[in-house]
Structure formats: C-alpha cells, structure tokens
C-alpha cells in the first residue's frame, strides 16, 4: 500500500500535526507545574482514509476490515508517530525542579 | 493520574483486545498470501474515557483539551501498545517464501 | 530579531561582589526562560542554572547552588548572574542563553561576559 | 569530568565527511535527546541540532544528528575551512539536569 501524504477529503481535513494553545488551567497542571503558563501543544487531528499515512500492516488491515465491517471495526486513527521532548519548571515538597518529559507533545503522525 | 483499567462505561466497552476473524480476501491479500487461509486479527476497539489506559502525558493533555474543546480536539483514541509477530507463507516470483511480520497483531492496547 | 546583549567584561580582586546583566530584545521575554552557561579558559561548557522571568522560578546545577545568584527584572527585559564573594577559580567567560519553547535546548546565546578574578 | 564522552578532536580534509560521537548512558541520551552545538573560535555557541535529528533554520544541511541507543553523533557532510570549531553535545541528566559533552575540536586538513 502506498504510504500517501495527499489527502484526499481536502487540504488539512486528513491526520496531520495541529497546535492547541492551552493554559496550565487547561491542561489540569495548575496545583503542580509551575512553567511555562502557557503551552502550545502539538496533537494528531484528522480523519485517516485508505492508505493515507498508514504506519504499518496492522493499519492496513485495519482499514479493510472497516470498510467490511463498519459497525464493528473503528477506521484507523491519528496518533503522534513520535514526540518532542519538553522541560517543566515544577513544584516540589522542598521547592521547585526541572523535569523532562519525552511524551508530551506529538512531534509527526501517522494512522494506526 | 490513574492509569485506569476499570472501564466506567460498562464491561467491555472500552479500549480492549477483539479478535476478528477474517479471511484472506477480507484482508486484501487473496493475491499474494498464500498461508494462512484464514487469521484471527487481534486488534484495539473501545472507547477512551478519562484516565483509562492512558499511554502518557499526551493523552492526559488530549483528554483535558477535549474535555475543554470536544469540536476540535478528538478524545484519545484505542490503539495497540505493541504487537505480536505473525509469519506468512507468501507468493514469489520464483515460488514460495517465509516473511515474518511484527506489527501486524495488536498484543496489548492503549489510549493515545 | 532575538537577541541577548550581555555587559561588559569584568576584572576583580578575590573576595568582591559582581553582577552581570543579559538584556533581551526581539521576543517577548517573560515567555522564554534564560539559562546562564560557564566556559573556563580552555574547557567546555558548564550549566549554571535557570530562571523562568515571568515568575523568577530559579533553579541551579548542584554545582553551582549556593555559589551564584540568578535573577531577573522582567521590566527591562533583562537576566542577571551575580557573585557576593569572587574567587579565583570563578575567572570564566559567562554566556546567558535562551532556551528553546520546549525548554531542552538552548536557541540565541549571548555574546559572553569574560569575568577575570586576581588579586 | 563530563556526564556525556566526545573525542577530543577529530579532522578531516575539505570535501570529506567527518562524525562526532557523543557517548551517555541510560539516564541521559538512552532515554532522552540531544542537541548539539557549535562554537567558532573567539564566539559564543551556536544551536546546530535540537532533539536528535532538528537543524533550526539557517543551518545548512551539511549538518545532521542521529541516535541510537545510549550514544549520539553528529555527521558533517562536504567538510569547508569555516567548520573549523568546538562541538558539544548536550542532553538531560536526572541528576544535574542540563548535561554538555566535553566539546570535540574539528580541524579541517589542509
């Protein structure tokens, strides 16, 4: 199957990379992490037809037993392929720290 | 947050193992399979609500964005968290050939 | 464009007290924390420690915690790094830098500081 | 001495490709990333690789990172006279957070 990149429902309708302003509020960190206020997180949206950005065999499977049996097998999904890494200034008992995070934000997508 | 596996949904009804059965023409590969006829596809169906199975930070961060925007941002969505190998008996040019697969069996799954 | 304006070089005597500036220009500062970075004469990069300007949250390498002091007036835009009691080995060039958004790398670097510390 | 290991130096001759290994463990690179930097004589450092394999814009593509496991490198391509500089690699650390390699000078041949 070909691993297609061009949606074929529009620009922009197909499983692609968005960013989502959000507040620490927003995200439910408030009452634990301290910086940054704000974050501009980037998420897999999208919808994701036949051969477009299947990660693997499993996808294409997938996808044909959807399109056989729609009620039962869900269309494959948008989901990050890999993430940026990301440090945040936290609370602590004694203070604050730095933390890494390796799975926070999406960094590419494909459909699985 | 909890990484949940009660589903407060109802039994059964969230993001889980299924097994589907299907033939090799269901699958789109009547043309170039040989063995087996037929395979038992395990794969990853279910709803994701809050908390349940989350794979990592993103998709606690997707889950509170969809809570806060349910038009924009999609809810977690039911994948597989690894795989179980699975050979084929394959057509080839010459004959016959054995391939191994790794991604074509959902083992375990996850909301992402 | 982004840019960090650090003072000018330093010479001090043993014991004497210091403060170096980074000024920031071309972003909106409070939204980017600045890390200062040491250099002795000859040797790598070390890193000092951190400051989110928005809430002056400070966090310092355990190497450096105690011996230097971090801070920040977001009203100037401007970082600092400063000494209450110099001493010899602190003689080192002292960059200020920007961190990327995510806050795992380092994105603008600031020209330096060469603080020399002699008696 | 540094968390992360580099070479002290490497060379190599105009038009050539060299590598810069940068060696951690499973606290750092294994289970993070790595950025790299460069430092012209007399200047401060420059962002050339962010989050293992990311060139900011401006670098030219001569320059690109990889990973693997719990060692990084960086590959410079069409090797020019005005590569010559200090290269550090740096990561995360748990224990001292922000983590630099003891910096690898390139000198180009000739």
């Known amino acids: 199957a070909r691993n297609g990149d061009r949606c074929p429902l529009g620009p922009g309708r197909c499983c692609r990379l968005h960013t989502v302003h959000a507040s620490l509020e927003d995200l439910g960190w408030a009452d634990w992490v301290l910086s940054p206020r704000e974050v501009q997180v980037t998420m897999c949206i999208g919808a994701c037809p036949s051969q477009f950005r299947e990660a693997n065999m499993h996808a294409q499977i997938k996808m044909n037993l959807h399109r056989l049996k729609p009620d039962t097998v869900p269309a494959p999904c948008c989901v990050p392929a890999s993430y940026n890494p990301m440090v945040l200034i936290q609370k602590t008992d004694t203070g604050v720290s730095l933390q890494t995070y390796d799975d926070l934000l999406a960094k590419d997508c494909h459909c699985v | 947050a909890r990484n949940g596996d009660r589903c407060p949904l109802g039994p059964g009804r969230c993001c889980r193992l299924h097994t589907v059965h299907a033939s090799l023409e269901d699958l789109g590969w009547a043309d170039w399979v040989l063995s087996p006829r037929e395979v038992q596809v395990t794969m990853c169906i279910g709803a994701c609500p809050s908390q349940f199975r989350e794979a990592n930070m993103h998709a606690q961060i997707k889950m509170n964005l969809h809570r806060l925007k349910p038009d924009t941002v999609p809810a977690p969505c039911c994948v597989p968290a690894s795989y179980n190998p699975m050979v084929l008996i394959q057509k080839t040019d010459t004959g016959v050939s054995l391939q191994t697969y790794d991604d074509l069996l959902a083992k375990d799954c996850h909301c992402v | 464009e982004v840019q960090l304006v650090q003072s000018g070089a330093e010479v001090k005597k043993p014991g004497e007290s210091l403060k170096i500036s980074c000024k920031g220009s071309?972003?909106?500062?409070?939204?980017?924390?600045i890390g200062w970075v040491r250099q002795m004469p000859g040797k790598g990069l070390e890193w000092m420690g951190v400051i989110d300007p928005d809430g002056s949250y400070t966090i310092y390498s355990p190497s450096f915690q105690g011996q230097v002091t971090i801070s920040a007036d977001k009203s100037i835009s401007t970082a600092y790094l400063q000494w209450s009691s110099l001493k010899a080995s602190d003689t080192a060039m002292y960059y200020c830098a920007r961190y990327g958004r995510y806050g795992t790398y380092f994105d603008y670097w600031g020209q330096g500081t060469l603080v020399t510390v002699s008696s | 001495q540094s968390v992360l290991t580099q070479p002290p130096s490497v060379s190599g001759a105009p038009g050539q490709r060299v590598t810069i290994s940068c060696s951690g463990s499973?606290?750092?690179?294994?289970?993070?990333?790595v950025n790299w930097y460069q430092q012209l004589p007399g200047t401060a450092p420059k962002l050339l690789i962010y989050s293992n394999d990311n060139r900011p814009s401006g670098v030219p593509d001569r320059f690109s990172g990889s990973k693997s496991g719990t060692s990084a490198s960086l590959a410079i391509t069409g090797l020019q006279a005005e590569d010559e500089a200090d290269y550090y690699c740096q990561s995360w650390d748990s224990s001292s957070n922000y983590v630099f390699g003891g910096g690898t000078k390139l000198t180009v041949l000739g």
């Open positions: 071309g972003y909106s500062f409070t939204s980017y924390w």
């Open positions: 499973s606290s750092n690179i294994g289970v993070l990333y």
